[in-house]
């Protein structure tokens, strides 16, 4: 699998992974003890036909062209978890691996 | 996990799974021996904030609102394989489980 990586200076218009630091403090989410911030990344860009298609299904739907089907969109195709320490709302503090918090790769699906 | 199912008569505007039969013969893909056609399904519809969001990450990116980040889009969140019998282009015929050929659930990501 393959995905493009970009930054704020990139001129790339196609589907790409961009850096993004999520700051829980800035959101006012004080129930999260740690981390205060983390590198989440995000996906943005255009999905021209066949470029970075994750699934053969995406190609087949394009071929079949059903009513109302939009073209593929730029979305996470590989994600990873982070460990978090947080209040769970029942006066307990939990340490847990929270899935799908970091975008590792972007693609068209 | 939860996802909406619709059909061609539905008035649902939100992200939904629709039925779609892919016909390999109609595509002229004669290298596929079996199946001749299969139920692939596809995703279509609007992704309003928080509706059917697959990942907490989607919510966080919306909060952070970086440059160029589109809203979440309606895309497969659960897929399954089908078994296919096909010519591999090297005068061999292969039976294989081809991943991500059927959309089982749609969501916003």
């Amino acid at each position: 699998d393959f995905g493009l990586d970009c930054d704020e200076h990139s001129t790339e218009s196609r589907c790409c992974r961009y850096p993004l630091t999520v700051d829980f403090e800035a959101f006012g989410w004080d129930w999260i003890i740690a981390p205060k911030r983390y590198k989440a990344n995000y996906c943005s860009g255009e999905c021209e036909f066949v470029f970075l298609q994750k699934y053969p299904h995406t190609h087949l739907v394009h071929q079949a062209n059903p009513r109302g089907s939009a073209g593929p969109c730029c979305t996470p195709t590989k994600m990873s978890p982070i460990n978090m320490l947080y209040f769970n709302g029942k006066e307990q503090i939990i340490y847990g691996k929270i899935p799908a918090m970091v975008v590792d790769r972007c693609g068209c699906s | 996990d939860f996802g909406l199912d619709c059909d061609e008569h539905s008035t649902e505007s939100r992200c939904c799974r629709y039925p779609l039969t892919v016909d390999f013969e109609a595509f002229g893909w004669d290298w596929i021996i079996a199946p001749k056609r299969y139920k692939a399904n596809y995703c279509s519809g609007e992704c309003e904030f928080v509706f059917l969001q697959k990942y907490p990450h989607t919510h966080l990116v919306h909060q952070a609102n970086p440059r160029g980040s589109a809203g979440p889009c309606c895309t497969p969140t659960k897929m399954s394989p089908i078994n296919m019998l096909y010519f591999n282009g090297k005068e061999q015929i292969i039976y294989g489980k081809i991943p991500a050929m059927v959309v089982d659930r749609c969501g916003c990501s």
Partner: antibody, heavy 116, light 107 residues
Framework: EVQLLESGGGLVQPGGSLRLSCAAS????????MSWVRQAPGKGLEWVST????????SYPDSVKGRFTISRDNSKNTLYLQMNSLRAEDTAVYYC?????????WGQGTLVTVSS | DIQMTQSPSSLSASVGDRVTITCRAS??????LNWYQQKPGKAPKLLIY???SLQSGVPSRFSGSGSGTDFTLTISSLQPEDFATYYC?????????FGGGTKVEIK
């Protein structure tokens, strides 16, 4: 009703050639891959060749590769097997079969005897 | 090439008996295994495809199971018309190969 009728078998000398035909009816011939399978007298089954629905792709075992050629004429609903450089071990009943995940319909076969 | 080994090579059974035929592949073939029935002087007939799917028009007393390397054809209650030779065939990769056959005879 699916029907497959083989013809063209007979007695041929070693080194000779023969062309088998299989006339198909009862289904959309151009939509399906087709296969040939043979059975030597008193023996088991042996796959000989398969051709894709449009005729673009073919496959053979090593035992016949380079000597046998499978082809089809979708306008005539007919499958062919051109057999060259025939050997005694090619003696068998040759069956054509409609191909899906498996060979789901078979003809009654035509006997090819290779002998001097 | 993938070798297919059938057992037993022959068996004697009575009408109403439950009959089991096994087929073993020399390597894993997923569920790409088909079963055929052949009567003397006749063409083979497909019974089971993809290891366990019953071919249209085949009586439900025939069933198939297995995946990987070990497969089974079961006739739940043998009928007079079931006395024949049965072949397994792998369609996992070419060259497609058949088992040596199992002849089911009347006891």
């Amino acid at each position: 009703e699916v029907q497959l009728l083989e013809s063209g078998g007979g007695l041929v000398q070693p080194g000779g050639s023969l062309r088998l035909s299989c006339a198909a009816s009862g289904f959309t011939f151009s939509s399906y891959a087709m296969s040939w399978v043979r059975q030597a007298p008193g023996k088991g089954l042996e796959w000989v060749s398969t051709i894709s629905s449009g005729g673009s792709y073919t496959s053979y075992p090593d035992s016949v590769k380079g000597r046998f050629t499978i082809s089809r004429d979708n306008s005539k609903n007919t499958l062919y097997l051109q057999m060259n450089s025939l050997r005694a071990e090619d003696t068998a009943v040759y069956y054509c079969a409609k191909q899906d995940y498996a060979m789901n319909y078979w003809g009654q076969g035509t006997l090819v005897t290779v002998s001097s | 090439d993938i070798q297919m080994t059938q057992s037993p090579s022959s068996l004697s059974a009575s009408v109403g008996d439950r009959v089991t035929i096994t087929c073993r592949a020399s390597q894993s073939i997923s569920t790409a295994l088909n079963w055929y029935q052949q009567k003397p002087g006749k063409a083979p007939k497909l019974l089971i495809y993809s290891a366990s799917s019953l071919q249209s028009g085949v009586p439900s007393r025939f069933s198939g199971s297995g995946s990987g390397t070990d497969f089974t054809l079961t006739i739940s209650s043998l009928q007079p018309e079931d006395f024949a030779t049965y072949y397994c065939q792998q369609s996992y990769s070419t060259p497609w190969t058949f088992g040596g056959g199992t002849k089911v005879e009347i006891k």
